[in-house]
């Protein structure tokens, strides 16, 4: 059967006026997954995103990540979009200095 991913969005200061937002998906099976950052519901161009490899996490499941750099103050326009085994979900950027947001998608 399939195991849905745990999705976690974090933010970190990048350069003046910019932040890097990272979306991590973990503990999912099978390994096929779509993870992308969206602006206004539209997937960002390939060139503006960085993807990690889909790697085994040691428990028979997998993990990966995608990151992009955005302007501070525009966070509400950006969401991480995940598709896995026919299910999908969207995940917002947490507000500044907040704890990590974990969502187990069912």
């Amino acid at each position: 059967g399939s195991v849905p991913p745990m999705v976690n969005v974090t933010r970190s200061e990048a350069s003046e006026g910019n932040i890097t937002v990272t979306c991590r998906a973990s503990s999912f099976y099978p390994r096929n997954i779509t993870l992308t950052w969206r602006q206004d519901g539209v997937s960002l161009s390939h060139d503006t995103q960085q993807w990690g490899d889909v790697l085994p996490d040691g428990n028979g499941t997998y993990q990966t990540w995608v990151a992009t750099r955005i302007c501070q103050g525009e966070e509400q326009r950006f969401t991480c979009y995940m598709e896995h085994s026919g299910n999908h979900s969207t995940h917002p950027v947490p507000s500044g200095n907040s704890h990590h947001h974990h969502h187990h998608h069912h």
């Epitope: 602006q39 519901g41 539209v42 161009s45 390939h46 060139d47 509400q76 326009r77 979009y81 969207t90």
Partner: antibody, heavy 116, light 107 residues
Framework: VQLQESGPGLVKPSQSLSLTCNVT?????????WNWIRQFPGNKLEWIGY???????TYNPSLKSRVSITRDTSKNQFFLQLNSVTPEDTATYYC??????????WGLGTSVTVSS | DIQMTQTPSSLSASLGDRVTISCRAN??????LNWYQQKPDGAVKLLIY???RIHSGVPSRFSGSGSGTDYSLTIANLEQEDVATYFC?????????FGGGTKVEIK
């Protein structure tokens, strides 16, 4: 999800073109980007711009100085205003929803002629 | 802006034929390529998104493939209802741009 364009079919040169897109079956504040596209005689398609679910707008740089896209969330409608029109703006204007990678639902289009 | 060149501009094929339409970008668009069908009455429908993903409700005779700058749409067994104009669209580099269209007719 259904989209329907409406507006005047004839606009005089130098005036403003104003169109409405009425959306049913999905809230324009729920997600996604709500677009205007036009098709010139001869079939060439040109993306004009969109208003996102948060209300933020993004325009085609070639039209940015003349275009404005706004919305009325209470009526679930969004609007196109194109200023200082010329006969080259004669086209069929479509509204469409852009979901993730592609525009998955389109209106039927409304024909606009710019002529005196 | 990225230029999208579609070939052929028109074609005529027999019912049941396999039809392929090509779309070439003047730079790498990283699979961000969509295909639309426009019926003679002007109605536009999404067929294929992100190169090869089929939109819900689209018949399985439609398929897409490609990478880098070169992409294609294939109709496996042409039917009468497939008479339409087909457009490609790149969504990788703003502003999004469209191909010039391919008109498909029945012999």
């Amino acid at each position: 999800v259904q989209l329907q364009e409406s507006g005047p079919g004839l606009v005089k040169p130098s005036q403003s073109l104003s169109l409405t897109c009425n959306v049913t079956g999905y809230s324009i504040t729920g997600d996604y980007a709500w677009n205007w596209i036009r098709q010139f005689p001869g079939n060439k398609l040109e993306w004009i711009g969109y208003i996102g679910y948060t209300g933020s707008t993004t325009y085609n740089p070639s039209l940015k100085s003349r275009v404005s896209i706004t919305r009325d969330t209470s009526k679930n409608q969004f609007f196109l205003q194109l200023n200082s029109v010329t006969p080259e703006d004669t086209a069929t204007y479509y509204c469409a929803r852009w979901r993730n990678w592609a525009m998955d639902y389109w209106g039927l289009g409304t024909s606009v002629t710019v002529s005196s | 802006d990225i230029q999208m060149t579609q070939t052929p501009s028109s074609l005529s094929a027999s019912l049941g034929d396999r039809v392929t339409i090509s779309c070439r970008a003047n730079q790498d668009i990283s699979h961000y390529l969509n295909w639309y069908q426009q019926k003679p009455d002007g109605a536009v429908k999404l067929l294929i998104y992100y190169t090869s993903r089929i939109h819900s409700g689209v018949p399985s005779r439609f398929s897409g493939s490609g990478s880098g700058t070169d992409y294609s749409l294939t109709i496996a067994n042409l039917e009468q209802e497939d008479v339409a104009t087909y457009f490609c669209q790149q969504g990788n580099t703003p502003p999004t741009t469209f191909g010039g269209g391919t008109k498909v007719e029945i012999k």
